[in-house]
């Protein structure tokens, strides 16, 4: 006769491990008992359980309520056992020793591998600002057994580097993603992808990049000279910029206070019916937590009675 078993049994943490041991013998042979033992390099061989053909299943008190026979129907030649709720400490070598009548004793060893799936965590790096050099965007850490694979999935150009720390029963892997921040990266996803044999599918954690920047400011509204004539209504100046965080806008007049009736609404300066009093140099001040920018324009309101005058537009940043 011979034993049918497996060299390696692999289970995920918390699952039940079936340790297989089937005696393939002649029709007149019987299995008297099957003794299961844990083979430890330090502690030696320690009995786990014993299946007795006459007196049933015996379980080592250290494994009480954790060792069972597979559910019926059972073949009397099948000495397999179930180890319930596998934990990391169960990982190791096991021995099945079958005592048969009249053929004698047979034994086989197998390795139980307990996979510990990782629970990854993603930590964003320091705040990203346009103009910085190579900067940490995020780091991703996953610990498991065996060591997980940690990679990055993104359209953003950058570099990744990994390091691992080995513990007695697991390994922690940390991967860092570095990039040179630019405004085009704003809102782009950066995804940490963790692969592991104990996972049915990769675990993914996505971080949305935020890069602080402030664009140059410019003023629009003076393009149509006909709008800037005495008596015209609806004249506006609009300050153009963009940034992250979104910028705040402030309007001032360089050569005095804003004329009465001029209304500031965010990035737009709205004028009442125009008079020559509205001529002057207007300054748009744009700022966010990162920086500030200025743009100024000179407004000259034309009097139709004085056709020699023209609107003069000067823009400076």
């Amino acid at each position: 006769g011979e034993l049918e078993t497996s060299d390696v049994v692999t289970v995920v943490l918390g699952q039940d491990a079936k340790l297989p041991c089937f005696y393939r013998g002649d029709p007149d042979e019987q299995v008297g008992q099957v003794a299961w033992a844990r083979v430890d390099p330090n502690e030696g061989i320690r009995e786990l359980a014993l299946l007795h053909s006459k007196y049933g299943l015996h379980v080592n008190p250290a494994y009480e309520d954790r060792v069972e026979q597979p559910p019926p129907p059972r073949d009397p030649l099948d000495g397999s056992v179930l180890l319930r709720n596998a934990v990391q400490a169960d990982e190791g070598e096991y021995e099945c020793r079958v005592s048969t009548f009249p053929a004698g004793s047979f034994q086989a060893r197998m390795r139980l591998r307990v996979l510990v799936p990782p629970l990854p965590s993603l930590n964003p790096g320091p705040p990203l600002e346009e103009g910085q050099g190579l900067t940490l965007a995020a780091s991703c850490t996953a610990e498991g057994s065996p060591a997980p694979s940690v990679t990055w999935d993104t359209e953003v150009k950058g570099t990744q580097s990994s390091r691992s720390f080995t513990h007695p029963r697991s390994a922690a892997v940390t991967s860092e993603f570095h990039l040179v921040p630019s405004r085009s990266m704003n809102g782009q996803p950066l995804t940490c992808v963790v692969s592991h044999p104990g996972l049915l599918q990769d675990r993914r954690i996505t971080h949305t990049l935020q890069v602080a920047f402030l664009a140059e400011a410019s003023v629009r509204g003076l393009e149509d000279q006909n709008l800037w004539q005495v008596g015209r209504e609806g004249a506006t100046l609009k300050c153009l910029s963009e940034g992250q965080p979104p910028p705040k806008y402030n309007w001032t007049r360089l050569d005095g206070p804003l004329p009465s009736g001029v209304r500031v609404k965010g990035d737009t300066l709205g004028f009442p019916p125009l008079t020559t009093e509205h001529s002057g140099v207007y300054v748009c001040h744009v700022s966010n937590e990162l920086s500030s920018r200025d743009s100024q324009v000179t407004v000259e309101v034309l009097d139709p009675e004085d056709p020699g005058k023209q609107v003069d537009l000067v823009s400076a940043s």
Epitope: R46, E47, A49, L50, K54, H58, V59, S99, F101
Partner: nanobody, 119 residues
Framework: EVQLVESGGGLVQAGGSLRLSCAAS????????MGWHRQAPGKQRELVAT???????NYADSVKGRFTISRDNGKNTVYLQMNSLKPEDTAAYYC?????????????WGQGTQVTVSS
């Protein structure tokens, strides 16, 4: 042949404890199983507990949590610690040694020791 000698029986009040011992001698196998059965007057003999040479155990549901079986392989002795005894535990307790024999197992029995639990 195997000879078994039990000791430790007696009269005890409900809730009390007793420890039974059974020493085996003779042709003891390296894969033997030892244990205890009991038989109350007018009833069939029933399994109480058995223990392997490696220390794995099997208990009847009626004694789980109250009785503990142990063995000393060097002395070929098996013990039964009985706590929280109840009147229904009253019976003759028999030691058994289960040895491989030919095409199966042979049970060797002791003479028994009486346990009486009074209420």
């Amino acid at each position: 042949e195997v000879q078994l000698v039990e000791s430790g029986g007696g009269l005890v009040q409900a809730g009390g404890s007793l420890r039974l011992s059974c020493a085996a001698s003779g042709s003891i196998s390296s894969i033997n199983l030892m244990g205890w059965h009991r038989q109350a007057p007018g009833k069939q003999r029933e399994l109480v507990a058995t223990i392997t040479r490696g220390g794995s155990t099997n208990y009847a549901d009626s004694v789980k949590g109250r009785f503990t079986i142990s063995r000393d392989n060097g002395k070929n002795t098996v013990y039964l610690q009985m706590n929280s005894l109840k009147p229904e535990d009253t019976a003759a307790y028999y030691c058994v040694d289960v040895e491989p024999s030919g095409m199966g197992w042979r049970d060797y029995w002791g003479q028994g020791t009486q346990v009486t639990v009074s209420s």
